[in-house]
Structure formats: structure tokens, C-alpha cells
């Protein structure tokens, strides 16, 4: 806390400039106007203080609005931003795409703080769900960003903002997370067609369910082994060779190599030995021949 | 034959909530997306969201978001749709409605419920 | 937000052709569907995906879709084709429906 003392003669600041960085701290509190400064909020940024100087700053934008700050003054925050705690961003009410992009920029380069996981929420939230505007721009500054959200919050987002996913934001995710965002693809992709669905839709396959694997595999689709092997093990097991053949076409000789690894490994010991025989890449473990198979599965449904 | 069966008229006061159920009979072992789409007396049809067959996903129309909950007991094959915040102006008969049609872009409504009434009055 | 506009009624004879048009910005590029309600029933879909018929729906209903423009045609229309007709389709983030044709068979 800076002590109350008074301006200096001749101190008095009249604007937000250069000379400001030789005023000690407790002369920045007694000559700066905080109304000058939250007028003049653009200017700072520009100015080389040190990080005491804008603790004091910061202090006296926080006399002047103990609510919180008001949008115009947040929009010029610039480095300012990083000296303000999760607590005083939740007093903020930010609508502007832009003032967002502004202080996303100022922590650009560095993991997502918790300041600026905050200032998204409260965008978000203010917002009413997650457009494909604001998520154009989390995505371009934090790609992990989607992923970092619960399945929950994933619900909030509609399917026209799925245009703006590009496949490296979905790295991070895992299958309840594509489980949300899957059948919101199938929503934002439906007026497709064919190859130009499946391009878009590849990304989001590890949420598919085995009925939407089937629909596909009579598409000529060509699924590499990449794809494949994110798909969810439980909806990969009820494909039959033939369905597996189909969805792969040419790939499907890059299942010997993955035979060992789930979902394939999986899904070999559920298949007759004879039917993967007739694939002809010598992957073994399937039911012998005489064998029979009791789908349990459906007599747990049936009772 | 597939029917969509979808429980009984309410009346409510404003302010309150409803929530309609919509169970499936027939070829349950399959799960839909299901549609809820609502008509007010004497007007057109108005969607309301939609949710995935598993039930984790829903997308609703901009118009009910945050006032309006889909959610789905796939051990009994019902949909359910609540309604907050009732007004009069949400008196309507509401609709469920599925997407049963073969093909990955299909999701016109081919199979519809008998229609709830919903009553808001004071 | 994104409208389907009809044309609020639609006369015919019995035995002669129906269209009912829907028009949207760019619905050419949706795929469109067409309900057909009768007073005090749940709708019936007629087309979906432009043109095509789910099964049991008679061959005299079909449809088209081009530029802004969908269609339904109803040939050699039938007394029990008397109705209200909505399109439908995806606008990005919601399916809409069109604002209704009653079809009057004269």
C-alpha cells in the first residue's frame, strides 16, 4: 500500500507520458489522476514502467472502479493485464472480440495463466455459448484450447463455430470430449457430400459410434491408420472384416503393423480366424474355426 | 411398428418448469437422434434442439439456450425435454421427433410422437 | 436469424399439380425436407435431402432444390393431400422451418 502524500509542486501529471517513468512510486500515487489515467489507458503501454510503477497504476484504477474495471479502460490494458488476479478479472464484464484478442496477445507465447483462463470464462459465459468468432481466435492463440474444456462446457458450443476446429486442436482431447463435439460435426457437415464429409469429419471419428462406422465404410472412404486407430474401441469391436476392409480400402495393410495395439488387437479377438484370413496379412488370434460366438452384449439388453 | 409415445398434457403457472417424456417402442435396441420441435395454438412449427443417441451431446436453438434441457435414459429408450421459466407465450403442443433415415447426413424427422400439450396460465 | 419463406395457401383441383415453393438465402446449398400436417396430427415427412421419399410416401410427392428456392410438387393431387406443408433445413447452428402453406384441394 503506497502512503497518502502530496503532489509536488510542479508534479501534477497533465497527460500519460515519458516523463512518468522518472516519478518515484509514491509520486506516481500523489500526482497521477486516476480518471487522467483510465482515459489515457492506450498511452501506457507504450511507456517502458517497471513492474512496481504498474503495481501502481493498477492501484489507482482500482480506487476509481471497485466494481471492476469498465470495458474501455480493459481494452487498453495492455501489459497492466498481467499484474491483475483472477479476482478482479471476475469483476469485469467483457462483450468486445477485440478487447479479448487484446489482452490474449499480451500473454501470447505462454501457457494459458489462470488469469487468462478466467477472462475467457467470463467471455464465454457472457456470451452465452462459444461462437465461431471467439473461437477462431482461442484456437490461434491457445490450440489446446478445446480440449481443455469439460464435456459440460463443450455442449455450450454450436455446431457452425466446428467450422473454425482444424485437426491439431483435437490432439489434446479425449473420448468424452469427442463424444460431446462428434455428433455436433455430423450437425455443421450434413450438407456435404461423400469425400468432402469425410475430410471434415476425420478429425472428430473418435467420437463416432459403430453404426456411424458402418455408414461410412459404404462410402469408399479410405481411412488411413492413423484415424483408425483413435477410433473407440467399443464402437470399433462389432465390425465385421468385411466392414473393417471397406472403411480402410487400401490401408487396411497397415493392420498388421498395429496388431498388437488397441483398438486392432481388440478387435482381432473378436473376429473369426477364418474371416481374417481372407485378408491375407497373416494376423492371428481370432476365434478357430468350429468355435461359437455368444454376443452377451445383447442378452444383457435383452433381460 | 415404431412409435414415439410421449407422456401427458400439463398445465402450468408462469414461472415454472415442465418437463415432457418421449419413450420409444418397437426397434429399441437402436438409438436416433432425437428432435423436440414445439407449435403454438394456431401458428407453425418452431425447433428446439436436438440430442445425440447416447444422450452426452445436445445442441438447442439460440431462442431456448439456457432455459431449455435435453437429456436422454438410453436403459429406458426416453428422451426428456424441460422447459424453465415458463410464459404464456410457451403454451404449445411440444413434438419429439427422430431421425431414423439411413445415411450419415440424414437428420429430417421421420418418426414423431402424438404431441404434448402444454398449458401456461395464471 | 436465418427465415423459410412460403406462400401462405395454395389452391388446386383434384387431379392437377400443386407446387409449393420455399425460399431462403442460399438454400440451394441445404439439403431441404418438407412436412405434411393435417389439423390435430403430429407432422408427416413427405422429402428429405431435396427429393427424396422416406417409405410408404406415395410417388406423386417430390421436390428439387436450386439457388434460393425449394420446391414441392404434388401431382394429380388428392382430396386427402389437403393440408399444411412446411420446408425445412440447417441453417449453421439450427434447423428451421418454413412459415407454412395450407394446400386447399378444391
Known amino acids: 500500500e503506497v502512503e497518502k502524500t502530496a503532489c509536488p509542486s510542479g508534479k501534477k501529471a497533465r497527460e500519460i507520458d515519458e516523463s512518468l517513468i522518472f516519478y518515484k512510486k509514491w509520486e506516481l500515487e500523489a500526482c497521477v489522476d486516476a480518471a487522467l489515467l483510465a482515459t489515457q489507458m492506450d498511452r501506457v503501454n507504450a511507456i517502458p514502467f517497471t513492474y512496481e510503477q504498474l503495481d501502481v497504476l493498477k492501484h489507482k484504477l482500482d480506487e476509481l472502479y471497485p466494481q471492476g474495471y469498465p470495458e474501455s479502460v480493459i481494452q487498453h490494458l495492455g501489459y497492466l493485464f498481467l499484474k491483475m488476479s483472477p479476482e478482479d478479472i471476475r469483476k469485469w464484464n467483457v462483450t468486445s472480440l477485440e478487447t479479448l484478442k487484446a489482452l490474449l496477445e499480451v500473454n501470447k507465447g505462454h501457457e494459458m495463466s489462470p488469469q487468462v483462463a478466467t477472462l475467457i470464462d467470463r467471455f464465454v459465459k457472457g456470451r452465452g455459448q462459444l461462437d465461431k468468432d471467439t473461437l477462431d481466435t482461442l484456437t490461434a492463440f491457445y490450440p489446446g484450447y478445446l480440449c481443455s474444456l469439460s464435456p459440460e462446457e463443450l455442449s455450450s458450443v454450436p455446431p457452425s463455430s466446428i467450422w473454425a476446429v482444424r485437426p491439431q486442436d483435437l490432439d489434446t482431447c479425449d473420448p468424452r470430449q469427442l463424444d460431446v463435439l462428434y455428433p455436433k460435426a455430423r450437425l455443421a457437415f450434413q450438407n456435404m457430400n461423400g469425400s468432402e464429409y469425410f475430410v471434415k469429419i476425420q478429425s472428430f471419428l473418435g467420437g463416432a459410434p459403430t453404426e456411424d462406422l458402418k455408414a461410412l465404410s459404404q462410402q469408399n472412404v479410405s481411412m488411413d491408420l492413423a484415424t483408425f486407430m483413435k477410433l473407440r474401441t467399443d464402437a470399433v469391436l462389432p465390425l465385421t472384416v468385411a466392414e473393417v476392409q471397406k472403411l480402410l480400402g487400401p490401408h487396411v495393410e497397415g493392420l498388421k503393423a498395429e496388431e498388437r495395439h488397441r483398438p486392432v488387437r481388440d478387435w482381432i479377438l473378436r473376429q473369426r480366424q477364418d474371416d481374417l484370413d481372407t485378408l491375407g496379412l497373416g494376423l492371428q488370434g481370432g476365434i478357430p474355426n468350429g468355435y461359437l460366438v455368444l454376443d452377451l452384449s445383447m442378452q444383457e439388453a435383452l433381460s | 411398428e415404431v412409435q414415439l409415445v410421449q407422456s401427458g398434457a400439463e398445465v402450468k403457472k408462469p414461472g415454472a418448469s415442465v418437463k415432457v417424456s418421449c419413450k420409444a417402442s418397437?426397434?429399441?435396441?437402436?438409438?436416433?437422434?432425437a428432435h423436440w420441435v414445439r407449435q403454438a395454438p394456431g401458428q407453425g412449427l418452431e425447433w428446439m434442439g436436438i440430442?445425440?443417441?447416447?444422450?452426452?451431446?445436445?445442441t438447442y436453438a439460440q431462442k431456448f439456450q439456457g432455459r431449455v434441457t435435453m437429456t436422454r435414459d438410453t436403459s429406458t429408450s426416453t428422451v426428456y425435454m424441460e422447459l424453465s421459466s415458463l410464459r404464456s407465450e410457451d403454451t404449445a403442443v411440444y413434438y419429439c421427433?427422430?431421425?431414423?433415415?439411413?445415411?450419415?447426413?440424414?437428420?429430417?424427422?421421420?418418426?414423431w410422437g402424438q404431441g404434448t400439450l402444454v398449458t401456461v396460465s395464471s | 436469424s436465418y427465415e423459410l419463406t412460403q406462400p401462405p395457401s395454395v389452391s388446386v383441383s383434384p387431379g392437377q399439380t400443386a407446387s409449393i415453393t420455399c425460399s431462403g438465402d442460399?438454400?440451394?446449398?441445404?439439403?431441404g425436407s418438407w412436412y405434411q400436417q393435417k389439423p390435430g396430427q403430429s407432422p408427416v415427412l413427405v422429402i428429405y435431402?431435396?427429393?427424396r421419399r422416406p417409405s410408404g410416401i406415395p410417388e406423386r410427392f417430390s421436390g428439387s432444390n436450386s439457388g434460393n428456392t425449394a420446391t414441392l410438387t404434388i401431382s394429380g393431387t388428392q382430396a386427402m393431400d389437403e393440408a399444411d406443408y412446411y420446408c425445412?433445413?440447417?441453417?449453421?447452428?439450427?434447423?428451421?422451418f418454413g412459415t407454412g402453406t395450407k394446400v386447399t384441394v378444391l
Open positions: 425445412q433445413a440447417w441453417d449453421g447452428d439450427a434447423f428451421v
Open positions: 442460399m438454400l440451394g446449398y441445404q439439403y
Open positions: 440430442i445425440n443417441p447416447s444422450g452426452v451431446s445436445t
Open positions: 435431402q431435396d427429393n
Open positions: 418397437g426397434d429399441t435396441f437402436k438409438r436416433y437422434y
Open positions: 421427433a427422430e431421425s431414423r433415415l439411413p445415411g450419415y447426413n440424414a437428420f429430417a424427422m421421420d418418426v
